[in-house]
């Protein structure tokens, strides 16, 4: 079983309702909002987490230049439609019949339209650039120590296979983490880079999705790494389709 047996909780997702009603009295957990059963040994999909959040009561230069096709999540929170596997449906609509297409991390990648809008496939986000600014410290972090700690964080806390952390760049106070995962690279059971990035984003904001009231304890050689700003860029396998009107606005 995958939930903590003793008090029947979901270690990897606090936005669940758990009860010992699984096979053999085992602990089983369901996501708030959708009621879908979740695997508590791994991360819950971003789509189910967003749905749960909406149902909850109403929180030499080495730096990479994001591509012209990079998306930033400017639309904020919405109540998404998820498929039976917990992934985002390619087309999302609101209560007023305004629809748009999203990528695999749920970020809008087309202009908004009406119910006639077609989204033929869910386009995969294969490259995520996490851009952080850390709070002032006595000195710069050692780059190799920082690199090793962040890779370990993604491997141990977010269960992301090390091969998907493509690079860690550092120019004090800016840290950039590059995650890359093509459709062909992602095997069954692999954590999706979009889910790992979302858990990391919530951790950094002090809104941890893991069980308990506590938060992230991230240190490099004993020095706390505290982030004061985060920007996340998403690159899709197929470039987004926005009208020129939006691009010149």
């Amino acid at each position: 079983h995958t939930a903590a047996q003793d008090n029947c909780t979901c270690p990897t997702n606090k936005m669940t309702v758990c009860s010992p009603d699984g096979p053999g009295g085992r602990c089983q957990c369901r996501a708030l909002g959708s009621g879908m059963a979740v695997d508590c040994s791994t991360l819950t999909s971003k789509c189910l987490l967003l749905k749960a959040r909406m149902s909850a009561p109403k929180n030499a230069r080495t730096l990479v230049r994001p591509s012209e096709h990079a998306l930033v999540d400017n639309d904020g929170l919405y109540d998404p439609d998820c498929d039976p596997e917990g992934r985002f449906k390619a087309r999302q609509c609101n209560q007023t019949s305004v629809c748009w297409c999203v990528n695999s991390v749920g970020v809008r990648r087309t202009d908004k339209g009406d119910l006639s809008l077609r989204c033929d496939e869910l386009v995969r986000t294969h490259h995520i650039l996490i851009d952080l600014r850390h709070r002032p410290t006595a000195g710069a972090f050692n780059h190799s120590d920082l690199d090793a700690e962040l890779r370990r964080l993604f491997r141990e806390r977010y269960r992301l296979h090390p091969k998907f952390v493509a690079a860690v760049h550092y120019e004090q106070p800016t840290i950039q983490i590059e995650l890359r995962q093509n459709t062909s690279q992602k095997a069954a059971g692999d954590v999706d880079i979009g889910d790992a990035a979302y858990y990391f984003e919530r951790d950094i904001k002090g809104e941890s999705l893991f069980q308990g009231r506590g938060g992230l304890d991230l240190r490099v050689r004993g020095e706390p790494l505290q982030v004061e700003r985060t920007l996340i860029y998403y690159l899709d396998e197929i470039p987004p389709k926005f009208s020129m009107k939006r691009l010149t606005a």
């Epitope: 270690p11 370990r152 141990e156 893991f210 009231r213 938060g215």
Partner: nanobody, 123 residues
Framework: QVQLLESGGGLVQPGGSLRLSCAAS????????MGWFRQPPGKEREFAAT????????YYADFVKGRFTISRDNSKNTVYLQMNSLRAEDTAVYYC????????????????WGKGTLVTVSS
């Protein structure tokens, strides 16, 4: 799968000392906060002490302050509870617990549990 194995429990006289150990195996717990809880006979399980993964922060319940000390050895994936000045009311099953990696040492974040070791304080 996560496994936590406690040892060091036993019978001790009032005023005596014991040192409990808990070895973590399965997933790496060098970056997990760890803690000790206890369940006295016929009572609910209660928090005793926690320690951050770096060992730089500890947190104790009022009833153990000044008597119990939590520590850890990350090279051995082991956490300890040194218990001094033991009293009859310390009699309980003592459970080791661990958080998700990189979680802080808040007791509410402890999600993985050992099976417990019995400590009996009696003359």
């Amino acid at each position: 799968q996560v496994q936590l194995l406690e040892s060091g429990g036993g019978l001790v006289q009032p005023g005596g000392s014991l040192r409990l150990s808990c070895a973590a195996s399965g997933r790496t717990f060098g970056r997990a906060a760890m803690g000790w809880f206890r369940q006295p006979p016929g009572k609910e399980r209660e928090f005793a002490a926690t320690i951050s993964w770096s060992g730089s922060n500890t947190y104790y319940a009022d009833f153990v302050k000044g008597r119990f000390t939590i520590s850890r050895d990350n090279s051995k994936n082991t956490v300890y509870l040194q218990m001094n000045s033991l009293r009859a009311e310390d009699t309980a099953v003592y459970y080791c617990a661990a958080s998700e990696p990189y979680s802080d040492y808040d007791p509410s974040g402890m999600v993985y549990w050992g099976k417990g070791t019995l400590v009996t304080v009696s003359s």
